[in-house]
Amino acid sequence: IIDGYKCKEGSHPWQVALLKGNQLHCGGVLVDKYWVLTAAHCKMGQYQVQLGSDKIGDQSAQKIKATKSFRHPGYSTKTHVNDIMLVRLDEPVKMSSKVEAVQLPEHCEPPGTSCTVSGWGTTTSPDVTFPSDLMCSDVKLISSRECKKVYKDLLGKTMLCAGIPDSKTNTCNGDSGGPLVCNDTLQGLVSWGTYPCGQPNDPGVYTQVCKYKRWVMETMKTHR
């Protein structure tokens, strides 16, 4: 997260880190005791999932292996549409005040809605500085029409944009797959943005979760 702030401890109990060994690979969101939602471009063969801590590499955090993941069947590495994936944990999480599932959306929030995005991604760009603490940024949803002025044909119909006019605050590498939460519901998964990160008036781009609720529910049901 560029130009963000340290999240209030324990305020994001659904936030997970997908680790490759001990290294951050991507963010993710707990949606069920067995399931984590993340970005399809975060796919690996297997994952170490850290839950229940705002500190990356926290020894006291729950760590659960995951060996199965299900990309959206329409995901394209070419056009990066449908950048959404479910990761099935090998064992269920122990829910607590520090570990909770996020609420999936009942509807799509409109432009102008205030949201918070979080992650352990780099706080500087292009040179990288990875924080140990979970970082947050407060952003507002931007209409597709406005966002298309910046990204033109790269912006797909199920992509969502968020940012703050004239501000550098934004997501960056390492934040991928993490949550954009608006009015206590998951509205976006961090997908992509302009590089170097933090260029004012270049919004962050997210997968619009409200458009995928049926796929999420059906995939969890099929593979339970």
């Epitope: 970005a39 399809a40 990066h80 997501t171 590498n173 997908s191 302009t194």
Partner: antibody, heavy 128, light 108 residues
Framework: QLQLQESGPGLVKPSETLSLTCTVS??????????WVWIRQPPGKGLEWIGS???????YYNPSLKSRVTISVDTSKNQFSLKLSSVTAADTAVYYC????????????????????WGKGTTVTVSS | DIQMTQSPSTLSASVGDRVTITCRAS??????LAWYQQKPGKAPKLLIY???SLESGVPSRFSGSGSGTEFTLTISSLQPDDFATYYC??????????FGGGTKVEIK
């Protein structure tokens, strides 16, 4: 600072497979969102993009070479490799590896990149 | 594929001259154009990216301009070290990246 070094046989027989490796030093190949790129230059000619790979393993190839090219990455060795099968004399060239700086990060990091750091190049001759 | 046409293919100039090289794309590439300098037996070196952004460490006598289909590289005052071949590269289409045929700047 970041350096790239190509290595591999300088002579390959027609119909065989050309194999080259690029070793990255002074930085990690896992530093997303960079693209790791192969480019070639036949003697006295211009530059041709062969393809690229992200540290995640996603590959992008020149359609004109796609059926013969494989690019792979080994993050543990900080290397990426090129294999070009069924070579002919037309594949004789200086082969360069390079780092591609993208315009976007994340899911779109393979889009729109230019090369800021290049290896010195290695000459590969295809001859029997 | 997007074709890149560079002109001239050879350019004879003297030290101190202002030199302009043109690159045309067969379709619009917005500002996604880079310029490279290559000396004999050496790898290309990045000079300009995003049509007009100067790469760090590159002398300010090099400048780039243009957008859409027409681009130029200008050397405001040619120095002895600038005699080389220059290539443009378009990176404004998803695949493949393509280069111009090159412009050789030689001593008059």
């Amino acid at each position: 600072q970041l350096q790239l070094q190509e290595s591999g046989p300088g002579l390959v027989k027609p119909s065989e497979t050309l194999s080259l490796t690029c070793t990255v030093s002074g930085g990690s190949i896992s530093s997303s969102p960079y693209n790791w790129v192969w480019i070639r230059q036949p003697p006295g000619k211009g530059l041709e993009w062969i393809g690229s790979i992200l540290h995640s393993g996603s590959t992008y190839y020149n359609p004109s070479l796609k059926s013969r090219v494989t690019i792979s990455v080994d993050t543990s060795k900080n290397q990426f490799s090129l294999k070009l099968s069924s070579v002919t004399a037309a594949d004789t060239a200086v082969y360069y590896c390079a780092r591609g700086v993208p315009t976007y990060w994340g899911a779109a990091s393979h889009y729109y990149y230019y090369m800021d750091v290049w290896g010195k190049g290695t000459t590969v001759t295809v001859s029997s | 594929d997007i074709q890149m046409t560079q002109s001239p293919s050879t350019l004879s100039a003297s030290v101190g001259d202002r030199v302009t090289i043109t690159c045309r794309a067969s379709q619009s590439i917005s500002s996604w154009l880079a310029w490279y300098q290559q000396k004999p037996g050496k790898a290309p070196k990045l000079l300009i990216y995003k049509a007009s952004s100067l790469e760090s460490g590159v002398p300010s006598r090099f400048s780039g301009s243009g957008s859409g289909t027409e681009f130029t590289l200008t050397i405001s005052s040619l120095q002895p070290d600038d005699f080389a071949t220059y290539y443009c590269e378009q990176y404004g289409s998803e695949s493949p990246l393509t280069f111009g045929g090159g412009t050789k700047v030689e001593i008059k």
